[in-house]
Structures are given as C-alpha cells and as structure tokens.
C-alpha cells in the first residue's frame, strides 16, 4: 500500500491544528448509514486531505471519505456498529492525526418534522404533535425530544420540554393571551445509542385565543 | 453505456518503459476509484495497482512498486499507468477496471476494458 | 498479504449438473469476497460480490455463499454458455488479491 505527498506539504501540513469532529447517521436513506466529518478550523487548506476509516467494518478493512466542499462523508451499509473504528486525515499514506471511535456514540438523529399545533377549546389547551423517521428505524428507535416554544417577541426566551413521546399537551393559561408563539422540536439518543442533538425541526408558528372578559378566559 | 479503451501497449526489451492509457466513457470518472489488472498467457488474473477517485492515493503489489506508476487526468476522462524497468514476467494482458460502487474504496470490478497486450522480450 | 486458494484448480462436468467452487483465504475477510467468470480471449465478467450478493443481470443459477475464511460460488444448473474460467478475488485489504481461477469443461 503506497501513496505520497511532496515533503514541503508534510512540514507545512505538520502546523496546522487538523482537529476534526463526526457524527453518524444510521438508517438514514433506507438501510444505508453515513458518516460525516469535518475539521473544526473553517480555514484549514483541505486541498490534499483526505479522510480514512479503518476497522469495525464489514467486507473492507478501510474506506475512503468523499469530499463535498468542506465536509467529508461515507454513506454506506458496511459499518460493522460494533467496537471502534479508527478515522484518521491523511496527506497521503501519512496519518496527520487520528481519533478512535464508536460510530454508535456519535449518532445524530434526522431532525423531527410534521410539527403541529392544535388548539383545544373544551380543554383549553394546545396539543403539541410531531412526527419523526425514527420510529420504523431497526436501530436508533429509542430518542429524547427537545420542544422549545417562545413569544415571538422574546427574541431569546425559550421554554424547553424534554419529552420521550412525540405528543405534548401546554396549559392555555401557562401561555400569554392573544400573542403569536414560534414552537420547534429537535431530538437527541436516548437508549444504548449516543450522541447529539439533531437539527431543529422546521418552526411552527400558532397563536393563542384572546381572553374572554365575562369568564376571564381565552377566546 | 460505460467503456474502457485501453492502448499503449506493445513489444519492449527488458529494462525499457511503456506507458498504457484507458480511456473512460459513459460515467463520471472522478467518482471513482480505478485499477490495472493483468493476466499472463494462460494464467490468472493479477491486480496490478489502484487509485482512490481523487487520485491522492495510490496502491500497489511489491511485484511492480517502485516500478509502476498509477495516474489519471479526471479532465480527459482518462487512467494511466507508467510502466518502467520493464521485465520478462511483465509480459501480460493489461485491463483496466472500474468498481461497481462510486467513491470510498470498494474494490470489486464491473467494467473492464478489452485489454491491451504488452510483451517485454529481448 | 492475505493468500488465496481456490479449487479445484479444473473441472469436468455435464449440463444440468450442479458446481461448487471453493476459495479460502489466509485470514477472516469479512465477506469482501467477489467472483468473476471468463472466457477465452474476454475480459472477466462480475458474478457476485459481498460474497453472496449476486450482480445485475446474472442468472439465478450462480449463487455466492460464506464468511469468515471459507467461500462457495455455486452454479445449480451448469448450462452451456457457463463453460469457463472462474476466479475469485478478496478486496477487504490492499494488496488485491485473485485466487487461481478454476476452469469448467464440458465432461
């Protein structure tokens, strides 16, 4: 096994700070995984650096990450998901640095979707619904919810719940009346697999009844 | 549909060069990964060398490192390989081959290109 | 370097008859296994690979099977046009390596 880099690049490439982080995303098109990494410096020169993985694989001892502008990933079926893999950047056949890894660990779940709100008049609540692909998943089925809701006008004031189910019921009179709420849902393992927290879900934007002066309700 | 073209190949004295082209049709070859393999007259198939699709790795048996020379040149949709030093035992049928699977290193070959024929006799 | 032994090295047998070949490799490769079918004067044509996963357009008669160290490329029903060479070839690590190759004649 050989490859090769011209020596200056070595002594230039041996300055730069080539930390990196990853994470895995498991069952993400139909049976296949990926894997994605990228350098934690934006200003690092990638022009000669790949990305490797060897080790808790199945049928390949190694495989090579793509490169798409600044990121690299695998999407693949091979990874064994059991024990660690070695990922190493690489100017060549040199290792630059390497870090070794469960894949099982630094899972990041597909962002929930579907987010919806449903005001119940008789309850005088909001129903909180969302869906998320991980529910027909064989692997990381198991996940905490993270909803965060706030005014609108409170530009950092978020409200979190974190939840196991993918339904939440919010009290009327825990909310302000007659105000517009942004709600957004995000989700993070929670059982034998580990890792982040996923993308945000797209926002959904609801507002609340005005209150109702006879009774001293909403509307 | 997908081709291979090799050419290049041809009679040589022991100690000589000879440099193979395959030319690529029919896929974007930048996504992969590319090998030489050869076969002696009546014998088995030999892996020969491999480059990773963007052509910063290359592989090779010790039977011809630090004689052979893997390249491509994705622009013109073509692979090389830069043969030196050049023995009897080199004497073989040279293929050039393209994975079934695009990027990260699956080594299982679909395509195949016919073949060039190159003899190193004095 | 991961070493492989493929036999029976040639093979006599009829149409219809069914046909096992067998490779073995130096160490556990994981199921990174392909087959190949050649003929004379053409270049190899992929059977199977994964070890049992069978390509496009192969009949289903060719069959891949085993792990660890020990593989089978099996052909239920030999039909004439399968008359030829059969190699297999580990990819789990560099160097590449093709076993033998195994040649089916007409009995």
């Known amino acids: 096994e050989s490859g090769y880099a011209q020596n200056g690049d070595l002594e230039d490439a041996e300055l730069d700070d080539y930390s990196f982080s990853c994470y895995s995303q498991l069952e993400v098109n139909g049976s296949q995984h990926s894997l994605t990494c990228a350098f934690e410096d934006p200003d690092v020169n990638t022009t000669n650096l790949e990305f490797e993985i060897c080790g808790a694989l199945v049928e390949v001892k190694c495989l090579n990450f793509r490169k798409l502008q600044e990121i690299y990933f695998i999407e693949t079926k091979k990874f064994l998901l059991i024990g660690k893999s070695n990922i190493c950047v690489k100017v060549g056949e040199k290792s630059l640095t390497c870090k070794k890894i469960d894949l099982t660990t630094i899972v990041k779940p597909e962002a929930p979707f579907d987010l919806s709100v449903i005001y119940r008049e008789g309850a005088n609540d909001f129903v909180v619904t969302f869906n998320t692909s991980h529910l027909q998943k064989k692997y990381v089925k198991v996940l905490m919810h993270d909803v965060a809701y706030r005014q609108e006008k409170d530009e950092n004031k978020w409200t979190h719940v974190n939840l196991s189910s993918t339904k939440l019921t919010l009290l009327q009179r825990k909310l302000q009346p007659a105000a517009m709420y942004e709600i957004k849902v995000r989700s993070i393992p929670d059982h034998y697999f580990k890792g982040f927290w996923s993308e945000w879900s797209p926002s959904y934007y609801f507002r609340t009844p005005e209150i109702n002066n006879s009774s001293g309700e909403m509307d | 549909q997908v081709q291979l073209v090799e050419s290049g190949g041809g009679l040589v004295k022991p100690g000589g060069s000879l440099r193979l082209s395959c030319a690529v049709s029919?896929?974007?070859?930048?996504?992969?990964?590319m090998a030489w393999i050869r076969q002696a007259p009546g014998k088995g198939l030999e892996w020969v060398s491999t480059i990773s699709a963007s052509g910063l790795r290359t592989y090779y048996p010790d039977s011809v490192k630090g004689r052979f020379t893997i390249s491509r040149d994705n622009a013109k949709n073509s692979l090389y390989l830069q043969m030196n030093s050049l023995r009897a035992e080199d004497t073989a049928v040279y293929y050039c081959a393209r994975p079934l699977s695009a990027h990260y290193g699956f080594n299982y070959f679909d395509y195949w290109g016919q073949g060039t024929l190159v003899t190193v006799s004095s | 370097d991961i070493q492989m032994t493929q036999s029976p090295s040639s093979l006599s047998a009829s149409v219809g008859d069914r046909v096992t070949i067998t490779c073995r490799t130096s160490?556990?490769?994981?199921?990174?296994l392909a087959w190949y079918q050649q003929k004379p004067g053409k270049a190899p044509k992929l059977l199977v690979y994964s070890a049992n996963t069978l390509h496009i357009g192969v009949p289903s008669r060719f069959s891949g099977s085993g792990s660890g160290t020990d593989y089978t490329l099996t052909i239920s029903s030999l039909q004439p046009e399968d008359f030829a060479t059969y190699f297999c070839?580990?990819?789990?690590?560099?160097?590449?390596?093709f076993g033998g190759g195994t040649k089916v004649e007409i009995k």
């Open positions: 070839q580990q990819y789990y690590d560099y160097p590449l390596a």
């Open positions: 029919g896929f974007t070859l930048s996504d992969y990964y």
């Open positions: 160490e556990d490769i994981y199921q990174g």
